[in-house]
């Protein structure tokens, strides 16, 4: 008998193993990325792994901790801030979540001269935001809505605010509206360059409708939440800016910042503060109706203590054919002349470009142009311009960086990325020193994510941040899914896809299909970056196609395709995903009895009306935490891209647009609408109105509520959501467990 | 290991002048310029930053010595100086060098004395 052995065991066929749920909810393949926190042109600090704060020179190559692990336990510290003058260190501790970027915290002030925590006249407790002054060691922090100030972390506080009060006034941190939907930030306050003056904001929220919400918490009694939360149409918090002299902060007291004549004649938002300098500050302000954008830059005079905001200093933006700016209105970057500035806006041909302003917005150099768009704009310095774009290869869904050399003339362009790890590395984003004497490149993909160390000068890698080594190592016995990006060509309209396949795909095979979307305005989810994630076990595991799709009103490839879903929220965005779906079938390796649809917030929304379009197209679909009517989000986002739920206005749009009034069409499919009950951001009145419109129109559906959970539906929720929404699909596709 | 050798204080009179010298050795210095620091302890009192240079010579100062106090560095002798003018009363401490921020374990030299008699 003649034995001959079978397949090698350990041949990488047999040793290689499909992702499973339990590797996602576990984070089992999560990347780290490193953002140095840059102390100086050449010096940066990072808490290591065992929570030493280290501090890190580059140029000579050594290191050092500057404050113990053991200090930071001895407050339960997450979290610290190094003074500009390297005397104190903030230490936060208590962390205690609001909403998006906002929290509380306690703070201890560390003084490193003589390794001792400072005592007396001690911070109170729990601060909203607290912060450095750019120069020396002088604090401000805002406290039960009111802003202080410490000359030196021992002094007893100046109170610079008195009439802050519990969602009614807030000095110096946003509410809920300007936080979420204008600033993206938990602070309303900025020091300016040199820390003479602070410039904050206040905004008044007297009169705006509050949302009330059940928490149920484990007491007898559910507690009631109230948030000032203005809805479409409804009032607006009032915003005012002052600035105060930090030096002799009682001499004058704070001075309000005017507001452009022609912005303060109807409602208006304040959209962000930029210092030029420390007697030059410049301010955007928005119309309520979001398509007129004023840049004010206002100096101040000495002799009247006053902020002087000359007409001739007013810079208007205006689109014709859409809302003001992208996502937000972009901000300035001031060159060293303070006056003239770069900034990002839509060049004649519609796309979003880098243009210098120098006296006028009618007289503004475009620096960059081309049919794809400028995305970022890192750091101006006297030689060079360091920017984010697209335009690499013609993918929108790449971020590379440039430089460009503004000292010389005609200015020339280098790409410092493309061609650096280029099939690992075509998505990045990059942190810089002072002076950009040397920056950090952190990858996101698609390759495993790489953060990078380089000198600013000749743009050479001084040396690897962070590899994920450990990570690369994990994945070699994983069957990871293939992903290709590409394009579809309908209609004289570009929809890029991103499509995840099975580890063995047979084109000549049949696969059920999944579509991810989220579709909002501004959005893109088509990017080269790494990701281990739910869809990603869908495909390796379940051996289902995932696709993804950008539609109209996505970002990143021009006016037209951005502002093509103006007034029309819900139409466009939905048509898309159907047409591509149509195509994606032409391609021949989707079972077509087997197409799902699921989105999370706009992606709820898009992923209902698709569901309920009568295209017989999608056997079941799932909508986490969907806007349901835009009569129900907030104003500052809606109305950007609806206008105003009135007669005169675009009241019909609003009610043509809401998956209530599509109750009828749910018959036919099968729907999982899932919401948490505490969601502050698009409220479970959402969900309650369209399961009311279901149970009317007497359809069929399952529904899952997450009691006390956010619009994020976090921690444990995540592992039941993951582990509900699987069974669903699998039991959609016929699927065995 | 972090070694400072601080020198050059004394004994003078108000609205004089002194200058301090500080030598670092060890390994951290070894390759090049740290960012370094002039501290200071008057009696009964906690030691505190009086100012500060990095490798690239860029100058911070306490705001009680600002326009009286310079400090420079001389960085191929490790050497870090601070020139005092205008002294005040007030001024009187022991005065040391050290990495700024300082390093954890801390590592101090013996200081110099310098007292100002009005």
């Known amino acids: 008998i003649v034995l001959r052995p079978s397949r090698v065991h350990n041949s990488e066929e047999n040793t290689m193993r499909a992702l499973t749920l339990k590797d996602i909810l576990n984070g089992t393949f999560s990347y780290k990325t490193f953002f140095p926190n840059w102390i100086s042109g050449q010096e940066y600090l990072h808490q290591s792994a065992d929570n030493n704060i280290v501090l890190y020179n580059i140029e000579t190559g050594q290191s050092y901790t500057i404050l113990s692990n053991r200090t930071m336990k001895s407050v339960n510290a997450s979290n610290y801030g190094l003074s500009p003058d390297r005397q104190f260190v903030y230490l936060e501790s208590d962390y205690s979540k609001l909403w998006r970027y906002s929290y509380t915290a306690t703070y201890y002030i560390y003084d490193l001269s003589n390794g001792e925590f400072v005592r007396g006249n001690e911070l109170p407790r729990p601060i909203q935001y607290l912060c450095w002054s750019p120069v020396g060691s002088k604090l401000a922090y805002v406290y039960q809505n009111n802003i202080y100030l410490k000359q030196r972390p021992g002094d007893p506080p100046f109170q610079i605010t008195f009439n802050g009060r519990e969602n009614k006034i807030f000095n110096g941190i946003p509410d809920w509206v300007y936080e979420e939907e204008m600033l993206a930030t938990k602070y309303a306050l900025w020091w300016s360059p040199n820390g003479k003056f602070l410039a904050y904001a206040e905004f008044n929220d007297t009169d705006i409708p509050v949302i009330a919400y059940s928490y149920y918490g484990d007491e007898q009694y559910p507690r009631t939440i109230n948030i000032p939360y203005p809805k479409a149409g409804a009032k607006n918090p009032v915003v005012r800016i002052f600035i105060i002299d930090t030096t002799y902060p009682a001499y004058v007291g704070p001075q309000e910042v005017p507001v452009p004549a022609m912005i303060a004649s109807s409602d208006y938002y304040f959209s962000w503060l930029t210092w030029v300098t420390d007697e030059r500050v410049c301010l955007q302000w928005l119309k309520r109706v979001q398509n007129v954008s004023v840049l004010s830059i206002c100096d101040f005079r000495e002799d009247w203590q006053t902020w002087d905001c000359p007409k001739t200093q007013e810079h208007i933006e205006e689109s014709r054919t859409g809302w003001a700016g992208g996502f937000f209105v972009s901000t300035p970057v001031f060159s060293y002349d303070a006056i003239s500035y770069y900034k990002i806006f839509s060049d004649k041909d519609g796309y979003k470009h880098i243009h210098y302003i120098k006296d006028t917005v009618e007289n503004a150099i475009q620096i960059t142009s081309g049919k794809w768009e400028a995305i970022n704009i890192f750091r101006v310095t006297q030689d060079s311009l360091f920017y984010s774009s697209n335009e690499f290869e013609e993918y929108p869904g790449r971020r590379n960086i440039y430089r460009i050399s503004i000292g010389s003339y005609p200015p020339s362009k280098k790409c410092v990325t493309c061609h650096l790890r280029k099939e690992r590395c075509q998505y990045y984003t990059a942190s810089f020193s002072d002076y950009a004497k040397y920056y950090a490149l952190v990858c996101y993909g698609p390759g495993i994510p790489i953060s990078t160390l380089h000198d600013g000068r000749t743009d050479q890698e001084i040396k690897i941040l962070e590899e994920n080594k450990e990570l690369e190592n994990a994945l070699k016995n994983i069957q990871l899914p293939k992903e290709e990006i590409k394009k579809l060509e309908v209609d004289e309209i570009t929809l890029w896809y991103k499509m995840i396949l099975p580890p063995q795909f047979d084109r000549s095979k049949k696969y059920p299909l999944l579509i991810q979307v989220y579709g909002g305005p501004c959005s893109q989810s088509v990017r080269s970056v790494f990701a281990v994630n739910w869809i990603s076990y869908l495909a390796s595991k379940e051996g289902m196609v995932i696709a993804l799709v950008d539609g109209r009103g996505t970002a990143f490839q021009g006016d037209k395709l951005l502002y093509a879903v103006y007034r029309k929220l819900g139409v466009y965005e939905v048509e898309d995903q159907i047409t591509a779906v149509r195509k994606f079938i032409e391609m021949g390796f989707i079972d077509e009895k087997r197409i799902a649809i699921w989105g999370w917030s706009y992606g709820g929304y898009v992923s209902s009306l698709a569901l309920a379009s009568g295209t017989g197209l999608f056997k079941c679909g799932i909508a986490v935490a969907p806007v349901s009517s835009w009569e129900y989000y907030a104003s500052v986002y809606t109305e950007r891209f609806m206008g105003l739920p009135t007669k005169d206005d675009n009241l019909e749009h609003y009610k043509n647009s809401t998956v209530m009034a599509r109750a009828e069409y749910f018959r036919n499919v099968d729907y999982l609408l899932i919401h948490g009950t505490a969601d502050d951001n698009v409220h479970f009145q959402n969900s309650a109105q369209i399961a009311k419109a279901l149970v009317n129109a007497q359809v069929d559906f399952q529904a899952m509520w997450y009691s006390d959970q956010n619009h994020g539906l976090s921690g444990l929720s995540t592992n039941h959501l993951y582990t509900h929404m699987t069974h669903f699909l699998k039991q959609c596709f016929s699927l065995s467990d | 290991q972090v070694q400072l050798q601080e020198s050059g204080g004394g004994l003078v009179q108000a609205g004089g002048s002194l200058r301090l010298s500080c030598v670092a050795s060890g390994t951290i210095f070894s390759s090049g310029a740290m960012a370094m620091g002039w501290y200071r302890q008057a009696p009964g009192k906690q030691r505190e930053w009086v100012a500060g240079i990095t490798g690239s010579r860029t100058t911070t100062y306490a705001d009680s010595v600002k326009g009286r106090f310079t400090i420079s560095r001389d960085n191929a002798e490790n050497t870090v100086f601070l020139q005092m003018n205008n002294l005040k009363s007030e001024d009187t401490a022991v005065y040391y060098c050290?990495?700024?921020?300082?390093?954890?374990?801390?590592?101090w030299g013996q200081g110099t004395q310098v007292t100002v008699s009005s």
């Open positions: 050290n990495l700024w921020p300082p390093s954890r374990p801390d590592h």
